[in-house]
Interface confidence: medium
């Protein structure tokens, strides 16, 4: 799981992904549900080695969160070829993995 620390790094990660699915976890240190799902998010990155997993701390990267129109914590967004292809909010493990399988 790659930690994104700037808007440039975020764009570079999307570009570098090519055709691969990119899953972005928008979270914050003060968010309880974010902490709860973090180990699961990391386990998915091992399970789905052909998918790119990114973490964005909304406090450290307000510009990325703003550009991606993140309105609440926790939000997951899904990108392919630089385009957003899915999004949902809430710390739901099943829906997170189901969405990856839908889009991979």
């Amino acid at each position: 799981v790659k930690q994104i620390e700037s808007k440039t790094a975020f764009q570079e990660a999307l570009d570098a992904a090519g055709d691969k699915l990119v899953v972005v976890d928008f979270s914050a240190t003060w968010c309880g549900p974010c902490k709860m799902i973090k180990p699961f998010f990391h386990s998915l990155s091992e399970k789905y080695s052909n998918v790119i997993f990114l973490e964005v701390d909304v406090d450290d990267c307000q510009d990325v969160a703003s550009e991606c129109e993140v309105k609440c914590m926790i939000t997951f967004q899904f990108f392919k070829k630089g385009q957003k292809v899915g999004e949902f909010s809430g710390a739901n493990k099943e829906k997170l993995e189901a969405t990856i399988n839908e889009l991979v």
Epitope: K47, N92, K93, E94, E97, A98, N101, E102
Partner: antibody, heavy 117, light 105 residues
Framework: EVQLQQSGAELVKPGASVKLSCTAS????????MHWVKQRPEQGLEWIGR????????KYDPKFQGKATITADTSSNTAYLQLSSLTSEDTAVYYC??????????WGQGTSVTVSS | QIVLTQSPAIMSASPGEKVTMTCSAS?????MYWYQQKPGTSPKRWIY???KLASGVPARFSGSGSGTSYSLTISTMEAEDAATYYC????????FGAGTKLELK
Amino acid sequence: EVQLQQSGAELVKPGASVKLSCTASGFNIKDTFMHWVKQRPEQGLEWIGRIDPANGNTKYDPKFQGKATITADTSSNTAYLQLSSLTSEDTAVYYCALLQYSAMDYWGQGTSVTVSS
Amino acid sequence: QIVLTQSPAIMSASPGEKVTMTCSASSRISYMYWYQQKPGTSPKRWIYDTSKLASGVPARFSGSGSGTSYSLTISTMEAEDAATYYCHQRSSYPTFGAGTKLELK
């Protein structure tokens, strides 16, 4: 406890339509995808499609496109499967299912649909 | 769409016998799922993530495989294992195999 309660058996005429229901308890259907699966007598399982009740987004096996319509009503925590222009090929048991990735997943008891004149 | 081919379609085994059934996928998949179904009942999740046993499944069952080739094995057949077993993949368009009917000899 998670449960999926399906509507009762249906006997319908060829050419008619039927709408089956699946009411969930023990979880909010907005939190996951609801799937429908067909099983013809003495046959295997066929995935029809699924709905994301949070936004109404649906996906169908191409084989069932135009035949099946999946909808959901989040206020009653219920998913629906509508089948149109029924023929004898549609005679089957239809299951709603919460196909999870973990050790447990959940299936309704099935609804038998018989198409006969 | 990924096609799953199960073999054999029907098999019989005596109590205590080792049983192996296979499922071949038309394209590579990450994980296989297996269901057990007995007549007149809904399918039951039996194996998930290729090799993990679902809750309440006896330890005599095991699952293995990768890529396009997967299998379910029963180390020692018991009467209660007689059922139809379906493999299942969870890609963008989920599919099921046609099933292997396991009968008690």
